[in-house]
Interface confidence: medium
């Protein structure tokens, strides 16, 4: 923070009287420095009334004064009011003012269109001091003007919180038309009307627009900017541009392609990413979208078996992510797969068909009609069954797994037997007498072990008991059969 001490000093009116003398034209500036803009008001000497001295609030230092002279009215000198120049040319303009030396804390700044020009390197302030006044010339230069330099420039000087403002200097940068809106590429439906817009500005104005289609002018008479071209419809792709003309010359917009929407090209590179017994994961590379975004895709699957009825399964999916898992397929089967995608116009042709196979799976059903009986003479248990239906084997049978559990007086023991695929019977030795034997059978393929059949129980009596009867898989819903002999 700073404090200003007021004191009795040179008494004189604030802005009265004529200009005391004139500025010599052969003066050279004692100082030239880049203009520090962005001034803020600060404490400065401000007479309370013309002709009245100040009374300070601290000890007053002795001042031997130069003889007082009347001060001139403070105003910027008139200068050029309007500068018209071409783009990329250089320009320099200035404002000048003579300020009594008492105002050693004034501020001078450049403003453009109401905004202060801060840190402007192209502003230079030159000072020409004399005994009583200092002539100030604030220059502003732009080496290569651009359209953005157009505007109204003023100088401001702040003295005692009063602002002195120069007359505005209007800078008008003229050049070729400058596009503010150019036509944009579009994808349109065949024979459907659409609009294109083109807008360009000067100065100089006016700016006139001509439309060009495939290198030929569309309109004989120019339209004043902005211009909207209505195209009634196209049957094939076309390139449009617009020409903007003013007194300085012509500017041509970028050429934009107008495409006609069509059905997509078929997908390419359909490939198998992964196969299981009942599903296939496929991917594809989408074809050209026909200038209209893909909506969805269709996966067509047919059995490759020549004996199949040739029916086609269809799976619909979204266009992204070019990946689909086809489910509910048969194991160890061959399929032909094709993909088609659609946009707003219609469906593409189907991609080239590819062959794919599901892998071998574990059987999906257990062996049927399991029966168990005791062969007491040989002390064996005979087991018979029917193999699962071929379609539900989900692969080539390699055998069966037999689980037999022996339970007697709180003791339980499970044994597993593997038997070959030939035949549909097996014989197991009696492990424990006076016990219950529970038998379950599962079919086995290279794909794994299928589900076990429902348990069939048979009671194995102590030696010397009478005859017996077989036990078999119960009808669904019945309790587990137990045969006690």
């Amino acid at each position: 923070a700073i404090t200003e001490a007021r004191e009795e000093a040179k008494p004189y009116p604030l802005f009265p009287g004529p200009f005391p003398g004139s500025l010599q034209t052969d003066h050279t500036p004692l100082l030239s420095l880049p203009h520090a803009s962005g001034y803020q008001p600060a404490l400065m000497f401000s007479p309370t009334q013309p002709g009245r001295p100040h009374t300070g609030n601290v000890a007053i230092p002795q001042v031997t004064s130069v003889e007082s002279k009347p001060l001139p009215p403070l105003a910027f000198k008139h200068t050029v009011g309007h500068i018209i120049l071409s783009e990329h040319k250089g320009v320099k303009f200035n404002c000048s003012i003579s300020v009594p030396n008492i105002y050693q804390d004034t501020t001078i700044s450049w403003w453009k269109d109401g905004k202060e020009l801060l840190g402007a390197h192209h502003a230079i302030t030159q000072f020409y001091p004399d005994d009583e006044v200092t002539a100030i010339i604030a220059s502003f230069s732009i080496t290569s003007v651009q359209r953005s330099d157009n505007g109204s420039y003023i100088c401001k000087m702040k003295i005692n919180n009063e602002e002195i403002v120069s007359d505005p200097i209007y800078i008008e940068v003229q050049g070729l038309p400058h596009f503010t809106k150019q036509p944009e590429s579009m994808n349109v439906t065949r024979n459907t009307a659409f609009n294109l817009t083109c807008q360009a500005v000067g100065p100089p104005e006016p700016v006139n627009i001509f439309w060009v289609q495939n290198s030929s002018r569309v309109n004989e008479q120019p339209e004043k900017s902005p211009s909207v071209l209505t195209v009634p419809g196209l049957t094939e792709m076309a390139v449009f541009s617009c020409e903007a003309h003013n007194d300085k010359g012509l500017t041509v917009s970028k050429g934009v392609q107008i495409n006609i929407k069509a059905i997509p090209s078929p997908p390419t590179e359909v490939s198998i990413r992964n196969s299981t017994a009942h599903s296939i994961l496929i991917s594809w590379v989408p074809g050209f979208d026909g200038y209209s975004p893909f909506r969805n895709c269709s996966i067509q699957v047919k059995e490759a078996d020549p004996l199949s009825n040739g029916s086609v399964m269809i799976f619909n999916t979204s266009a992204l992510p070019h990946l689909y898992q086809i489910k509910q397929l048969q194991a160890l089967a061959n399929y032909s797969i094709g993909v088609s995608c659609m946009n707003e116009i219609g469906w593409s042709a189907v991609s080239p068909w590819i062959l794919a196979s599901t892998t071998e799976g574990a059987p999906s059903v257990a062996p049927l009609n399991v029966t168990v009986f005791l062969n007491e003479s040989s002390d064996n248990v005979d087991i018979r069954w029917m193999k699962p239906p071929t379609k539900q084997q989900d692969g080539e049978l390699v055998g069966y797994r037999i689980s037999h559990v022996w339970q007697s007086a709180g003791i339980s023991k499970e044994l597993l037997e593997e038997v070959g695929q030939n035949g549909s019977r097996a014989r197991i030795s009696v492990q424990v007498h006076n016990a219950t034997c529970t038998v379950r059978i599962a079919a086995v393929t290279r794909g794994g072990v299928g589900p076990f059949s429902d348990p069939v129980k048979i009671f194995i009596p102590a030696h010397g008991w009478v005859d017996y009867a077989p036990s078999s898989t119960p009808a669904p819903g019945n309790a587990d059969p137990v045969l006690i002999i």
Epitope: A36, P61, Y103, Q104, T106, F127
Partner: antibody, heavy 122, light 106 residues
Framework: QVQLVQSGSELKKPGASVKVSCKAS????????MSWVKQAPGQGLQWMGW????????TYTDDFKGRFVFSLDTSVSTAFLQISSLKAEDTAVYFC???????????????WGQGTTVTVSS | DIQMTQSPSSLSASVGDRVTITCKSS??????ISWYQQKPGKAPKLLIH???SLQPGVPSRFSGSGSGRDFTFTISSLQPEDIATYFC????????FGQGTKLEIK
């Protein structure tokens, strides 16, 4: 050429006063504000404030209010710095420095005096 | 008040070296920074003002750059007569000096 010549070194006792002078030549004295800057031993530079050489109005920064007075004798183009009730911490080199711009809120110093050493010791 | 942080506080370099000193302000100072050279027992000498404007008569090996809060003073090829203390001054809001950089020859 433009120059500022300051008075010689001073050795003072605590409580005394000292007056340092700064004589300008080679330019219009009343056109450029004059600042004072303190450089204590082993310390950086500290701006003390400035005086309007035309009106004689001084402006002091917070650290230099009360015992410090800026004054002028424009007839001999001289600025003065007076320090009263001297303390040991006033021991420093004091520079006068001309403001580089005649009219500007923001200024730097383009010409400096050679400095005056003030030593306060009992 | 605006603080100016100058670094390094001292620096040793060889003749012909490129020397760089930085000043960082506590807020944007609108490029209002000047750089001074002070030799022992002498008055400071203005080298650069307004960030990069070289004072008339100052050799072109001295330069300044920066904006916002970060400013750099450079001596492109150090000469024996450049041995001095250098300091920055911000003059955007009141006046604040940097602490100074003492430059010595290796």
């Amino acid at each position: 050429q433009v120059q500022l010549v300051q008075s010689g070194s001073e050795l003072k006792k605590p409580g005394a006063s000292v007056k340092v002078s700064c004589k300008a030549s080679g330019y219009t004295f009343t056109a450029y504000g004059m600042s004072w800057v303190k450089q204590a031993p082993g310390q950086g530079l500290q701006w003390m404030g400035w005086i309007n050489t035309y009106s004689g109005v001084p402006t002091y920064t917070d650290d230099f209010k009360g015992r410090f007075v800026f004054s002028l004798d424009t007839s001999v183009s001289t600025a003065f710095l007076q320090i009263s009730s001297l303390k040991a911490e006033d021991t420093a080199v004091y520079f006068c420095a001309r403001r580089a711009a005649v009219v500007a809120k923001y200024w730097y110093f383009d010409v400096w005096g050679q400095g005056t050493t003030v030593t306060v010791s009992s | 008040d605006i603080q100016m942080t100058q670094s390094p506080s001292s620096l040793s370099a060889s003749v012909g070296d490129r020397v760089t000193i930085t000043c960082k302000s506590s807020q944007d100072i609108n490029k209002r920074i000047s750089w001074y050279q002070q030799k022992p027992g002498k008055a400071p000498k203005l080298l650069i003002h307004s960030t990069s404007s070289l004072q008339p008569g100052v050799p072109s090996r001295f330069s300044g750059s920066g904006s916002g809060r970060d400013f750099t003073f450079t001596i492109s090829s150090l000469q024996p007569e450049d041995i001095a203390t250098y300091f920055c001054l911000q003059y955007d809001n009141l006046l604040t000096f940097g602490q100074g950089t003492k430059l010595e020859i290796k």
